[in-house]
């Protein structure tokens, strides 16, 4: 089929970076400025992506490949191919409908993006809190309270059953 196609379809000979120009007797014409074709045999060239506003150019468009964008400082990429730019917040905050807001008590965010997550509930693993959590950092769990009491055996007691809706400590 491919051999038949190439014999019958002169467009299949047009390489990437060109298009098969129906207006010029199916001659392979170079892609016009600000357009590209990444595969051979194309009947049109695609318009290059433009990186505008908070989007900045990471890779220029060429006749054979599209431009690639990333985000200006203070923003980070979301979505495939950096289809969106989202404003950074500070650590200890999350982006809400009303802007960057501090994490509620009992939650933390150690990045400039994403949402505040609940502190680890140490007691669910039968452990105690070694270092308290903050808006920016999760709690650090230590040995179980039994391990810390004098004369306690080295056998860790089984973790208590998880209670539904147990609040983070």
């Amino acid at each position: 089929f491919e051999r038949t196609r190439s014999l019958q379809d002169p467009c299949s000979n047009c390489p990437a970076g060109t298009f098969c120009d129906n207006n010029r007797n199916q001659i392979c014409s170079p892609c016009p400025p600000n357009s590209f074709s990444s595969a051979g045999g194309q009947r049109t060239c695609d318009i290059c992506r433009q990186c505008k506003g908070v989007f900045r150019t990471r890779k220029e468009c060429s006749s054979t490949s599209n431009a690639e964008c990333d985000c200006t400082p203070g923003f980070h990429c979301l979505g495939a191919g950096c289809s969106m730019c989202e404003q950074d917040c500070k650590q200890g905050q999350e982006l809400t409908k009303k802007g960057c807001k501090d994490c509620c008590f009992g939650t933390f965010n150690d990045q400039k993006r994403g949402i505040c997550r609940p502190w680890t509930n140490c007691s669910l693993d039968g452990k105690s809190v070694l270092v308290n959590g903050t808006k920016e950092r999760d709690v650090v769990c230590g040995p179980s309270p039994a391990d810390l009491s004098p004369g306690a055996s080295s056998v860790t007691p089984p973790a208590p059953a998880r209670e539904p809706g147990h609040s983070p400590q």
Partner: nanobody
Framework: EVQLVESGGGLVQPGGSLRLSCAAS????????MSWARQAPGKGFEWVSG???????YYTESVKDRFTISRDNSKNTVYLQMNSLKPEDTAVYYC????????????????WGQGTQVTVSS
């Protein structure tokens, strides 16, 4: 072709006011959410304010109670009324479509104006 043209920038003293306008064409303005962003000298972009097609408004914390975004669908124009201006408001202000409807988020399909300079100085 989509066009966004900002105007109204200039030099103003601290405590003064300016009203920026953004004239839109080439798309259905009345059903589009719009936004304002700014870029201070040597700094990154900052999301300033947004307005939904229905009129709901959103502001970044630093301009709340000082800036007011509004729109006139009959004139295809969005405005940013800036009161009690401070030196830290000095920036190039950009008008942009706001297809994501999410605070602080723009998409690749959004369109941007060329910007208008606002300088707050005594």
């Amino acid at each position: 072709e989509v066009q966004l043209v900002e105007s109204g920038g200039g030099l103003v003293q601290p405590g003064g006011s300016l009203r920026l306008s953004c004239a839109a064409s080439g798309f259905t303005f009345s059903s589009s959410a719009m936004s304002w962003a700014r870029q201070a000298p040597g700094k990154g972009f900052e999301w300033v304010s947004g307005i939904y097609s229905g009129g709901s408004t959103y502001y970044t914390e630093s301009v709340k109670d000082r800036f007011t975004i509004s729109r006139d669908n009959s004139k295809n124009t969005v405005y940013l009324q800036m009161n009690s201006l401070k030196p830290e408001d000095t920036a190039v202000y950009y008008c942009a479509t706001w297809g994501t409807l999410r605070f602080g988020v723009w998409a690749e399909y959004d369109h941007w104006g060329q910007g208008t300079q606002v300088t707050v100085s005594s």
